[in-house]
């Protein structure tokens, strides 16, 4: 089974692809 999605758990339901952005999260390792 193929998957184009890693996880939608943290995604807000958007009305289309026009508002989607790639989010880079910084890890706090201090």
């Amino acid at each position: 089974v193929k998957s184009k999605i890693g996880s939608t758990e943290n995604l807000k339901h958007q009305p289309g692809g026009g508002k989607v952005q790639i989010i880079n999260k910084k890890l706090d390792l201090s």
Epitope: K4, I5, S7, T8, E9, L11, H13, Q14, P15, G16, G17, G18, K19, V20, Q21, I22
Partner: antibody, heavy 120, light 112 residues
Framework: QVQLVQSGAEVKKPGSSVKVSCKAS????????ISWVRQAPGQGLEWMGE????????YYNEKFKGRVTITADKSTSTAYMELSSLRSEDTAVYYC?????????????WGQGTLVTVSS | DIVMTQSPLSLPVTPGEPASISCKSS????????????LAWYLQKPGQSPQLLIY???TRESGVPDRFTGSGSGTDFTLKISRVEAEDVGVYYC????????FGQGTKVEIK
């Protein structure tokens, strides 16, 4: 395998309501949007609206706002589309489709369709 | 609302010959952040539910024959069939998902 199984054909009177169901299996129901699309006899495809089952969040085609309600029951992996104040122009085949929300935003699996006939 | 316009609306084809369908949107479908065009192509064979052929304007859905190719960006898109086969007959729809969803009117492909 992924399957979307819709409820059977309906005959309704003008002014009444219809509720069509779409039972999903073979994937995690909460992870994908369910869209509803209709097709009048001999006509093209028309998007009605969608629901993200995890949150219950919905978006609707302005044309149907106030007349259509889309809901989802996570416990049974079933989505519903209710259309009210039916008129003869609502006679159509109604499809549910799994929408790859979050990436391709494309409908990769479709139900078999439900014919709704509105007639007095 | 985003309006999708397909042409031609009817396309008689000869098996083995190429075919091309155009789809134009009233506004750009390109997300500059993701660098994706939110345009998909579907085929509805007679008596069947629609099936996904292409998404992101040019990415073939798994299982779709490589004779189907999608191209274009922004507002102008094209679906090409390199060599039409009898099983390719039906109605082809483009659909935008940049904002909500809108389908084109459909292009009926039939064998000459």
């Amino acid at each position: 395998q992924v399957q979307l199984v819709q409820s059977g054909a309906e005959v309704k009177k003008p002014g009444s309501s219809v509720k069509v169901s779409c039972k999903a299996s073979g994937y995690t129901f909460s992870d994908y949007v369910i869209s509803w699309v209709r097709q009048a006899p001999g006509q093209g495809l028309e998007w009605m609206g969608e629901i993200f089952p995890r949150s219950g969040s919905t978006y609707y085609n302005e044309k149907f706002k106030g007349r259509v309600t889309i809901t989802a029951d996570k416990s049974t992996s079933t989505a519903y589309m209710e259309l009210s104040s039916l008129r003869s122009e609502d006679t159509a085949v109604y499809y549910c489709a799994r929408d790859y929300y979050g990436t391709s935003f494309a409908m990769d699996y479709w139900g078999q369709g439900t014919l709704v006939t509105v007639s007095s | 609302d985003i309006v999708m316009t397909q042409s031609p609306l009817s396309l008689p084809v000869t098996p083995g010959e190429p075919a091309s369908i155009s789809c134009k949107s009233s506004q750009s479908l390109l997300n500059s952040r993701t660098r994706k065009n939110y345009l998909a192509w579907y085929l509805q064979k007679p008596g069947q539910s629609p099936q996904l052929l292409i998404y992101w304007a040019s990415t073939r859905e798994s299982g779709v024959p490589d004779r189907f190719t999608g191209s274009g960006s922004g507002t102008d898109f094209t679906l090409k069939i390199s060599r039409v086969e009898a099983e390719d007959v039906g109605v082809y729809y483009c659909k935008q998902s940049f904002y909500l969803r809108t389908f084109g009117q459909g292009t009926k492909v039939e064998i000459k």
